[in-house]
C-alpha cells in the first residue's frame, strides 16, 4: 500500500491522543534504555509502511501484535485516513490468520514494540533530518 | 449521517442459534471496526467482540467460549452476529456499535444501532 | 479482565443539585481509555464523556469528567430533568472490554 495521500495530521493526533499511551501500557516495566532503535523510516508514508509492517506482519519470535491494543487502534487510523486503505489489507489478513500464535508477551516483542515506538515518534517529526 | 439499523425481535428455544444483522449507512463501512454489545434485562452492558469489515478480523470476549460468531458482507454493508447454543441467560438486547475516533481522536463507541431484542425462552 | 466498580448504584438527587458519579478502576489506565455513556429507558447508550473529561458533540457544559490512573468521576453541576439516565463508565485499554455496572440518576 502506497502512503502518500493519508491524512498524516488526522493519524498524528490519534496517536498522540491513544495509539502512544497503549504503547506505553505494553511496555510497562521495560526501561526505555533497554533496547536500541535499528528500524528506521525517512518521511511520513515511509514510516506509516514500517509501522503497518512492524504491527501487522509476524516475525520471529513475535507472533502476536496484530491483536494488541494499539494495534486495532493503527488498523483503524490508517483504515480510516489512508484512502483504499482497509481494501487492500483483505488478501493480507487472510494470510496472517492462518500464521497468528497464541498471544504471548515475549522480549522480542517488547523490543518490537519499542521500534513501534520509535517510528510513531520519528513521523510525528517529518522535519527533521534523518540521524 | 451515519446511521445502523438492526434486525427484528427474535424468539428462540434453549440450545437454537440466533443471527442478529446490523446494516450501515452513511460512512464508509469498511474502515471502521463494528461491536457487538448486549443488555439483559435490567441489568448493564457487556461487550461481546468486534469485527472490521475491510477484511472480516474478529476479537472476541472469551465469556462467549466460541458460542459468537461475527461476520459481515461488504456487497450490503452489514455485519453479522450469531449466538449458538441459547439460554435463557442471553435474553437481552444486542446493540451494534461503531468505533471510531471522535474530534478529539479518543477511541470510543461513537454511534449505536436501535437495538435487537432477543428472547429465550421454551 | 479489567473490573469497572461504579458507585453509587443509585443516586437520588433533587433537580438543581450537583451530582457525582464514581467510576473505580481494577488496574490503572490511561485516562484517554475512559469513556462514559448515558442511557435512557427504552433508547440505545449515547457516548458522553471521551477520554475521562471531553464532552461528546451537543453535550451540555454542566458535565465534566475527571480522574486518573484507577479512580474516575463523572459530575453534573446541577442536574436538570433531562439529565435523569444510567450512566456507564467503560474502558478501551484492554481486551476484553468492559462497561461499569452503571449508575442510575433519579429524581429525589
Known amino acids: 500500500y502506497d502512503f502518500t495521500n493519508c491524512d498524516f495530521e488526522k493519524i498524528k493526533a490519534a496517536y498522540l491522543s491513544t495509539i502512544s499511551k497503549d504503547l506505553i501500557t505494553y511496555m510497562s516495566g521495560t526501561k526505555s534504555t533497554e533496547f536500541n532503535n535499528t528500524v528506521s523510516c525517512s518521511n511520513r508514508p515511509h514510516c506509516l509502511t514500517e509501522i503497518q509492517s512492524l504491527t501487522f506482519n509476524p516475525t520471529a519470535g513475535c507472533a502476536s501484535l496484530a491483536k494488541e491494543m494499539f494495534a486495532m487502534k493503527t488498523k483503524a487510523a490508517l483504515a480510516i485516513w489512508c484512502p483504499g486503505y482497509s481494501e487492500t489489507q483483505i488478501n493480507a489478513t487472510q494470510a496472517m490468520k492462518k500464521r497468528r500464535k497464541r498471544k504471548v508477551t515475549t522480549n522480542k516483542c517488547l523490543e518490537q514494540v519499542s521500534q513501534l515506538q520509535g517510528l510513531w515518534r520519528r513521523f510525528n517529526r517529518p522535519l527533521l533530518k534523518q540521524q | 449521517q451515519v446511521q445502523l439499523v438492526q434486525s427484528g425481535a427474535e424468539v428462540k428455544k434453549p440450545g437454537a442459534s440466533v443471527k442478529v444483522s446490523c446494516k450501515s449507512s452513511?460512512?464508509?463501512?469498511?474502515?471502521?471496526?463494528m461491536n457487538w454489545v448486549r443488555q439483559a434485562p435490567g441489568q448493564g452492558l457487556e461487550w461481546m467482540g468486534q469485527?472490521?469489515?475491510?477484511?472480516?478480523?474478529?476479537t472476541y470476549n472469551g465469556n462467549f467460549k466460541g458460542r459468537v460468531t461475527m461476520t459481515r458482507d461488504t456487497s450490503t454493508s452489514t455485519v453479522y452476529m450469531e449466538l449458538s447454543s441459547l439460554r435463557s441467560e442471553d435474553t437481552a438486547v444486542y446493540y451494534c456499535a461503531r468505533s471510531g475516533f471522535d474530534y478529539g481522536y479518543f477511541y470510543a463507541m461513537d454511534y449505536w444501532g436501535q437495538g435487537t431484542t432477543v428472547t429465550v425462552s421454551s | 479482565e479489567i473490573v469497572m466498580t461504579q458507585s453509587p448504584a443509585t443516586l437520588s438527587v433533587s433537580p438543581g443539585e450537583r451530582a457525582t458519579l464514581s467510576c473505580s478502576v481494577s488496574s490503572s489506565i490511561s485516562s484517554s481509555n475512559l469513556h462514559w455513556y448515558q442511557q435512557k429507558p427504552g433508547q440505545s447508550p449515547r457516548p458522553w464523556i471521551f477520554g475521562t473529561s471531553n464532552l461528546a458533540s451537543g453535550i451540555p457544559a454542566r458535565f465534566s469528567g475527571s480522574g486518573s490512573g484507577t479512580e474516575f468521576t463523572l459530575t453534573i453541576s446541577s442536574l436538570q430533568s433531562e439529565d435523569f439516565a444510567v450512566y456507564y463508565c467503560?474502558?478501551?485499554?484492554?481486551?476484553?472490554?468492559?462497561f461499569g455496572g452503571g449508575t442510575k440518576v433519579e429524581i429525589k
Open positions: 467503560q474502558q478501551w485499554s484492554s481486551y476484553p472490554l468492559t
Open positions: 469485527i472490521f469489515p475491510g477484511d472480516g478480523d474478529t
Open positions: 452513511g460512512y464508509a463501512f469498511s474502515s471502521y471496526w
